[in-house]
Interface confidence: medium
């Protein structure tokens, strides 16, 4: 059973909000981790979107618009990435990672290597 689980694919219509789920296996406690989210478009390297530990401890990646937001549900041991006002360019692979509260680049890269499991968010154009 993997430490992290994400749905293999999700879809929603343009202009709507989609929420991607990243579930931490229940022998770990998401309450002590930051949740990191990355986006990878076809042919591009992964892009850091955001880190979320709590409402008062979070950070947004460079040039990442506020329609990308993070949250956590400690009861369900889940991290979420919400993307509002879905646009065609949001069609991509989205990766979550868990790590310590620090937002240092080296740590993010280490988590990327160790803990990442992909989920695809596909925008269905109506």
């Amino acid at each position: 059973q993997p430490v992290l689980h994400q749905p293999p694919a999700m879809s929603s219509a343009l202009g709507t909000t989609i929420r991607l789920t990243c579930t931490l296996r229940n022998d770990h406690d998401i309450g002590v981790y930051s949740v990191y989210w990355y986006q990878q478009r076809p042919g591009h390297p992964p892009r850091f979107l955001l880190r979320y530990f709590s409402q008062s401890d979070k950070s947004q990646g460079p040039q990442v618009p506020p329609r990308f937001s993070g949250s956590k549900d400690v009861a369900r041991n889940r991290g979420y990435l919400s993307i509002s006002e879905l646009q065609p360019e949001d069609e991509a692979m989205y990766y979550c990672a868990m790590g310590a509260r620090s937002s240092e680049k080296e740590e993010r890269e280490r988590e990327w290597e160790e803990e990442m499991e992909p989920t695809a968010a596909r925008t269905r154009v109506p």
């Epitope: 689980h5 909000t17 989609i18 400690v74 009861a75 369900r76």
Partner: antibody
């Protein structure tokens, strides 16, 4: 085969107490979030309380907050609902319900018990 | 808390009819909505999860759609065994809430 069996219901006077139990079998109980849902006679479903798989996180409907206590014993594969200060409006069939496994990406109640009737009347 | 408003609360239909039940959430809940069927004296049964996914063993005449605040349950061709009460339920966050139910009866 997954089974959830509730017990502990019965007739109680207003202000009284009851403890409901839900015995689980056929699955690894400690991996699953569990909930209590009730249904008053002739009425709809009302979520009462939920508890995370490790028992660390708990929530209640406003209508029972401060009066009901949910708990679980993973070693005994059992879920409990301690109901105090009971009122006539707590009269209902009480169901325990399992939330789907953690690696599913939704939180539906995939298995339910048969229910136990609690009647609060003087 | 998130409120769910189901409509209609009562529906009279004939075998073979196409039936649609609507559930409206008081705030956006992505696709975290489930549908249940309940027959008298029985526990509810999960039909549709995550707005549009058919639970294993549920006939394909049942389908669900929607996201955000508007959701629908459709029965494409009503069968005798489908006469029951249907409930929507949000699982976006605790406290979980149910819609008021839709009773489908024989016309």
């Amino acid at each position: 085969e997954v089974q959830l069996v509730e017990s502990g219901g019965g007739l109680v006077k207003p202000g009284g107490s009851l403890r409901l139990s839900c015995a689980a079998s056929g699955f690894t109980f400690s991996n699953f979030e569990m909930n209590w849902v009730r249904q008053a006679p002739g009425k709809g479903l009302e979520w009462v309380s939920g508890i995370s798989s490790n028992g660390r996180y708990i929530n209640y409907a406003d209508s029972v907050k401060g009066r009901f206590t949910i708990s679980r014993d993973n070693a005994k594969n059992s879920l409990y609902l301690q109901m105090n200060s009971l009122r006539a409006e707590d009269t209902a069939v009480y169901y325990c319900a399992r939330v789907v496994d953690f690696d599913q990406d939704y939180n539906g109640f995939d298995y339910w018990g048969q229910g136990t009737l609690v009647t609060v009347s003087s | 808390d998130i409120q769910l408003t189901q409509s209609p609360s009562f529906l009279s239909a004939s075998v073979g009819d196409r039936v649609t039940i609507t559930c409206r959430a008081s705030q956006g809940i992505s696709t975290d909505l489930n549908w249940y069927q309940q027959k008298p004296g029985k526990a509810p049964k999960l039909l549709i999860y995550a707005a549009s996914n058919l639970e294993s063993g549920v006939p394909s005449r049942f389908s669900g759609s929607g996201s955000g605040t508007e959701f629908t349950l459709t029965i494409s061709s009503l069968q005798p065994e489908d006469f029951a009460t249907y409930y929507c339920q949000q699982s976006y966050n605790w406290p979980y809430t149910f819609g008021g139910g839709t009773k489908v009866e024989i016309k």
